[in-house]
C-alpha cells in the first residue's frame, strides 16, 4: 500500500463529522458540456462558473451557456445568466478577470453573423453586468493593462488594434494591420504591424512599434522582425539577418530604444526560439536544433540578456505541439525541472537548484524500487510527468505543483527508473524543493495544496468508475486519511481551489449521468474544522533551504546567499491562515568562482572553474560584437551571475581587455538599417501562454 495509508497513521480525530458538516453539494441545472471557473479577487470567496453546451448542426453551431456565481468559495452557486441577458458566452475566451483585486470581469459574447461583438462588464465582483456592443470582433481575449484595470487592449479579427480607457465603455482604433500586441510596463503597448496586411506569410518583414500614450504617438523600434516577446525587464526580438531565412535574437532593456545582439545561435525557418522563464535579472532561452529533432539547447543569460551560457543540451521541446516539460519550482528559489531527449530517444527528467548552472537527475525516492527501464536495479532516478506526457495521452491528470507560500513542497506524477515510463504513474512529493523525494500516493491523482501547505488534498483518477472519496494530509503527505464526501459517486472531472493555496476550501467537480441527461455537480469541502486552532510560534521550526551538507559552512549557499525559513512542523495540525506570510531570513555567503559566469569572449574548460579567453572569436560571435556599445566590449572575463548576492571571498580581478579589436564582421551594419528603426534591430511575434501546461514567456 502507498505510504501513510495505514490505520495507525491518522492524526486527525473525529474528522468525519467535522467534514460532513462542512461539505456542500451544488447540482447545476444544465446539460454537461464544458465548465470554466474563475476566482474574482483574492480572498473574496467569489467564483464564477460558466457552463457551455454546443451542438454542431449542419454548418452552424447551436450553443447555450449559463453563468453561476458563488460568494462563499463554491459552497453555494446562484444562476445569474439573466444578468447577461441569457447570451451565449464564448468559452474559448474564458472569463477575463481584472488584475489585483479590482473586482473587474469581462465576458465576451458570441454574436453570430454580426460585424461587431458584445461584451458584458462588471466592476463589482460580478454582482452586476453592463452590456456593451463592440465596433469590432475580438480575435483574442481582451487584455487589461496590468497596472490600470480601466485600460483595455483588444486585437480584432481584421487585425485592428483597439484601446479602451474607461473599462470597455468606449473603444478607439489606434492602428491597423497589427499582427500581435502586448502590454509592456508602465502602460506601454508593443505591437508588430505589416503594411501588406499579412501576418503569417510575411513573418520576417514585420515592423515592431511602441506606443507609450495609448496610441497618441508611435515609434518604430525594429524592422525585419519575425517575432517579439517580453520577459521580465527584457524585450526580445528575432530579426531576419539578411542571410536567407536565418534570424537572430536581439534584446533591449530600455523598452526598445536601443538593442544589442544576443550571443545566441541564429536559427532557420524551421527552428524557433522560446523564452522558458524570465525575471528582471535573467532569462532562460530555448534554441531549437535544426531539423525536426524535438529538442534544442537551454541557454541562461547574464543580467543584460546579451551573454548566454549553455545550460542544458538535448532539451525536449516538440516542434509540432510546442510541448516542453520546463517548470519553475516556485516553492524554492533557483529550482527548475525539465526533460531531455536522451541519445537512446528515452525521455529523462533533469533538475537544477542553481538557476540553470548545473543540471542533475532527480534522486531516487527511498521508498521506491527501480522499474523495468532501469539497467541497474539499485541505481536509478525519479522522472516526472509534465506537459509532454499529458500531450501524448498518458494517464497523468495533473502537472507538477508547487506554490511560493508552501515552502519546499513539490507534488508530481512520476516513475522511478532510467527514463520516463509509459506505465501507470504514482504521485511523489518533495518537502525540500526537489532534493529528496518520497512516493506519496499509489496511482494517478488530482491534488491540491491548501492553507499554504498545511493541508494537502488528493482525489484518485478513475476514468471508469465514479468517485466519492477525497484524501487529505496534514503532515506534508506522510500520512493520508480518506473522507467519503457522498454516497452517490460522481464522474469526477477535476479539483478546484482558490489560486494562491491560501484557502481551506476545495471543490470537486464532476457530473452525474442518467439515461437521458448529464448534470454538472460540485462538492465543496471546507477543512477549517480539521485545522481547528491557529498556528503559534511553537508550531514552526527553522529550515535551511538548499541544505546538502550541514558540516559545510557554505551549506545552503545558492547564488551567493542562504535562506532560513520558519516552516510548519509536520506534527502540527493547525491553520497557517489566509494572512500567513512566509518568514525567511537571508544571510550573505562568501564569493567563489561558482558565483561568476564567463563574459563574452571567455569560456570555462570542462571541470575548471576559471574563465579562459577564447583563442579567437568565430562565426556568430563576431556578429555579436558589432552592435555592442563600448561598455559591452570591455571585460575582465567574469561577470557575476544574475541575482547572485555573494560578498567577499574570491574576487576574480584580472586585466580588463578591450575585445573591440577582435570584431571584424560588418554584419547588418546600422547604417544599412531601415531609417525608421531606432536601434540596430528589433523583433516581433507571439507570447504564448500554453495553458494546461505551464506559462511559457514567449514561443515564436
Amino acid at each position: 500500500s502507498a505510504p501513510g495509508e495505514d490505520e495507525e497513521c491518522g492524526r486527525v480525530r473525529d474528522f468525519v463529522a467535522k467534514l460532513a458538516n462542512n461539505t456542500h453539494q451544488h447540482v447545476f441545472d444544465d446539460l454537461r458540456g464544458s465548465v470554466s471557473l474563475a476566482w474574482v479577487g483574492d480572498g473574496t470567496g467569489v467564483i464564477l462558473a460558466l457552463t457551455t453546451f454546443q451542438v454542431p448542426i449542419f454548418m452552424i453551431t447551436i450553443g447555450q451557456s449559463k453563468l453561476y456565481r458563488s460568494e462563499d468559495y463554491g459552497k453555494n452557486f446562484k444562476d445569474i445568466t439573466d444578468l447577461i441577458n441569457n447570451t451565449f458566452i464564448r468559452s474559448d475566451f474564458g472569463i477575463a478577470i481584472g488584475p489585483e483585486n479590482s473586482g473587474k470581469v469581462i465576458l465576451t459574447a458570441d454574436v453570430s453573423g454580426s460585424h461587431g461583438s458584445r461584451i458584458f462588464r462588471s466592476s463589482d465582483f460580478a454582482k452586476n453586468f453592463v452590456q456593451t456592443d463592440l465596433p469590432f470582433v475580438p480575435l483574442m481575449q481582451i487584455t487589461y493593462n496590468p497596472e490600470n484595470s480601466n485600460v483595455l487592449l483588444a486585437l480584432s479579427n481584421k487585425n485592428e488594434l483597439w484601446v479602451s480607457k474607461n473599462f470597455g465603455g468606449k473603444w478607439e482604433e489606434i492602428h491597423d494591420t497589427v499582427c500581435l500586441a502586448k502590454w509592456g510596463r508602465k502602460g506601454t503597448i508593443f505591437f508588430t504591424a505589416n503594411h501588406n496586411g499579412s501576418c503569417s506569410n510575411d513573418r520576417g518583414m514585420l515592423e515592431l512599434w511602441r506606443t507609450s500614450d495609448l496610441g497618441k504617438s508611435f515609434k518604430t523600434i525594429g524592422v525585419k522582425i519575425y517575432s517579439f516577446g517580453l520577459g521580465g525587464k527584457f524585450l526580445f526580438a528575432s530579426v531576419m539577418t539578411g542571410k536567407g531565412t536565418l534570424r537572430r535574437i536581439h534584446v533591449s532593456t530600455d523598452q526598445g530604444d536601443t538593442w544589442s545582439m544576443a550571443q545566441l545561435p541564429s536559427v532557420g525557418h524551421e527552428q524557433f526560439y522560446s523564452i522558458l522563464a524570465a525575471n528582471d535579472e535573467m532569462v532562460f532561452m530555448h534554441v531549437d536544433e535544426p531539423g525536426d529533432s524535438g529538442f534544442g539547447t537551454i541557454f541562461t543569460s547574464d543580467d543584460r540578456g546579451i551573454v548566454y551560457s549553455k545550460s542544458l543540451d538535448r532539451h525536449l521541446y516538440t516542434t509540432t505541439g510546442g510541448e516542453t516539460d520546463f517548470i519553475n519550482v516556485t516553492s524554492l528559489r533557483g529550482v527548475f525541472t525539465t526533460s531531455i531527449l536522451a541519445e537512446d530517444k528515452s525521455i529523462q527528467t533533469m533538475i537544477t537548484f542553481d538557476q540553470g548552472g548545473r543540471w542533475t537527475h532527480l534522486r531516487k525516492p527511498e521508498n521506491s524500487e527501480c522499474d523495468a527501464t532501469a539497467k541497474n536495479k539499485n541505481e536509478c532516478s525519479l522522472h516526472i510527468h509534465a506537459a509532454y506526457s499529458i500531450a501524448t495521452g498518458l494517464n497523468v491528470p495533473m502537472l507538477p505543483l508547487s506554490e511560493p507560500n508552501a515552502v519546499g513542497l513539490v507534488l508530481a506524477h512520476g516513475s522511478v527508473g532510467d527514463a520516463i515510463s509509459v506505465m501507470r504513474p504514482d504521485v511523489y512529493i518533495s518537502d525540500d524543493g526537489g532534493y529528496s523525494w518520497t512516493k506519496m500516493l499509489e496511482g494517478p491523482h488530482h491534488y491540491a495544496i491548501l492553507d499554504s501547505g498545511g493541508l494537502l488534498v488528493a482525489v484518485e483518477q478513475n476514468a471508469h468508475q465514479g468517485v466519492n472519496v477525497i484524501k487529505f494530509s496534514t503532515d506534508e503527505g506522510q500520512c493520508w486519511q480518506t473522507y467519503t464526501f457522498t454516497r452517490d459517486p460522481i464522474f469526477f472531472t477535476g479539483l478546484a481551489s482558490e489560486p494562491g493555496a491560501r484557502s481551506m476550501n476545495v471543490s470537486l467537480w464532476g457530473y452525474r449521468s442518467s439515461l437521458f441527461h448529464q448534470q454538472w455537480v460540485s462538492y465543496t469541502i471546507d477543512f477549517k474544522d480539521i485545522l481547528e486552532r491557529n498556528c503559534e510560534e511553537k508550531d514552526y521550526t527553522i529550515w535551511l533551504a538548499h541544505s546538502t551538507d550541514p558540516e559545510d559552512y557554505e551549506d545552503g549557499c545558492i547564488l551567493g546567499y542562504k535562506e532560513q525559513f520558519l516552516r510548519l512542523r509536520k506534527s502540527s495540525v493547525c491553520q497557517n491562515g489566509r494572512d500567513y506570510v512566509v518568514t525567511k531570513q537571508p544571510s550573505i555567503c562568501l564569493c567563489s568562482l561558482e558565483d561568476f559566469l564567463c563574459d563574452f569572449g571567455y569560456y570555462r574548460p570542462e571541470n575548471d572553474s576559471k574563465c579562459v579567453e577564447q583563442p579567437e572569436l568565430k562565426g556568430h560571435d563576431l556578429e555579436f560584437c558589432l552592435y555592442g556599445r563600448e561598455e559591452h566590449l570591455t571585460t575582465n572575463g567574469y561577470r557575476k551571475i544574475p541575482g547572485d548576492k555573494c560578498q567577499g571571498g574570491v574576487n576574480p580581478v584580472r586585466e580588463v581587455k578591450d575585445l573591440k579589436k577582435k570584431c571584424t564582421s560588418n554584419f547588418l551594419s546600422p547604417e544599412k538599417q531601415n531609417s525608421k528603426s531606432n536601434g540596430s534591430a528589433g523583433g516581433s511575434g507571439g507570447l504564448n501562454d500554453i495553458f494546461e501546461a505551464q506559462k511559457i514567456e514567449w514561443h515564436e
Epitope: I542, S547, P550
Partner: antibody, heavy 120, light 107 residues
C-alpha cells in the same frame, strides 16, 4: 554521560610548540564536527578552529592560520590541536567543543578546558 | 568578519528581576545565533540555539528571540545561580565569532 576532556596544556616559550588532545566519550564521536575555542585570561571567547566529522572541512581563525593544525582520530575518539610558532597572545584556556548536527549549529558540549601559557 | 556587539557589558540585578541582554550582528545572520552561560571557573554551557530554541535541560526562565541582526536573551526571574557571563555566538559565517560578553551579578 557525554563528556569531553582536554589535555596537553602547559607552559611554553614563544616560538615553541604544543599539542593539545581532547578525549570524547558518551556519544558517536565520528558523527560530529569538533572545534577548539580559546579564552584569554579575563577576556571573552574566541573561536580557533573547526574540523568536520570525516575531516573533509577544516577551518581556522586568521589569527592561527598557518601555525595551528587541527586533526582527529575517529578510531580513538580523539581531537587534536598542533600549535607551532606560539606567541604570547596565544596564552589562553583552550576548550574543545562539539558542534550540534544541524546546519550552522551551536556548540552543545564543552570540555573543562586546558591552560596554555606562552611566556619567556 | 561578522562583529557581534553585546550590551550591556555588565548588569547588577536583584533576584526575581527580569534581565534582558541584546546582541547585534554587523550583518544579517538569519537565525544562526546562540547563547551561552559561563559561570566563574567553569566552561561555557549552551542555553539557547538558533536564536530562540531552548537547549535541553535549560530552565524555562531563559528564552531567546530575534532574527537577522537583532537578538535578545531574556532571564525572566533571575535566581542567584544565574550569576555568570553570557555570550552570544554566530555560526552563520566564517570566522565564527562571539559577542564580548555580559557579566550578570546578583545585588
Amino acid at each position: 554521560e557525554v563528556q569531553l576532556v582536554e589535555s596537553g596544556g602547559g607552559l611554553v616559550k614563544p616560538g615553541g610548540s604544543l599539542r593539545l588532545s581532547c578525549a570524547a566519550s558518551g556519544f558517536t564521536f565520528s558523527s560530529y564536527s569538533m572545534n577548539w575555542v580559546r579564552q584569554a585570561p579575563g577576556k571573552g571567547l574566541e573561536w580557533v578552529s573547526s574540523i568536520s566529522s570525516s575531516s573533509s572541512y577544516i577551518y581556522y581563525a586568521d589569527s592561527v592560520k598557518g601555525r595551528f593544525t587541527i586533526s582527529r582520530d575517529n578510531a580513538k575518539n580523539s581531537l587534536y590541536l598542533q600549535m607551532n610558532s606560539l606567541r604570547a597572545e596565544d596564552t589562553a584556556v583552550y576548550y574543545c567543543a562539539r558542534r550540534g548536527s544541524g546546519s550552522y549549529d551551536a556548540f552543545d558540549i564543552w570540555g573543562q578546558g586546558t591552560m596554555v601559557t606562552v611566556s619567556s | 568578519e561578522i562583529v557581534l556587539t553585546q550590551s550591556p557589558d555588565f548588569q547588577s540585578v536583584t533576584p526575581k528581576e527580569k534581565v534582558t541582554i541584546t546582541c547585534r550582528a554587523s550583518q544579517s545572520i538569519g537565525y544562526s545565533l546562540h547563547w551561552y552561560q559561563q559561570k566563574p571557573d567553569q566552561s561555557p554551557k549552551l542555553l539557547i540555539k538558533y536564536a530562540s530554541q531552548s537547549f535541553s535541560g535549560v530552565p524555562s526562565r531563559f528564552s531567546g528571540s530575534g532574527s537577522g541582526t537583532d537578538f535578545t536573551l531574556t532571564i525572566n526571574s533571575l535566581e542567584a545561580e544565574d550569576a555568570a557571563a553570557y555570550y552570544c555566538h554566530q555560526s552563520s559565517s566564517l570566522p565564527l565569532t562571539f559577542g564580548g560578553g555580559t557579566k550578570v551579578e546578583i545585588k
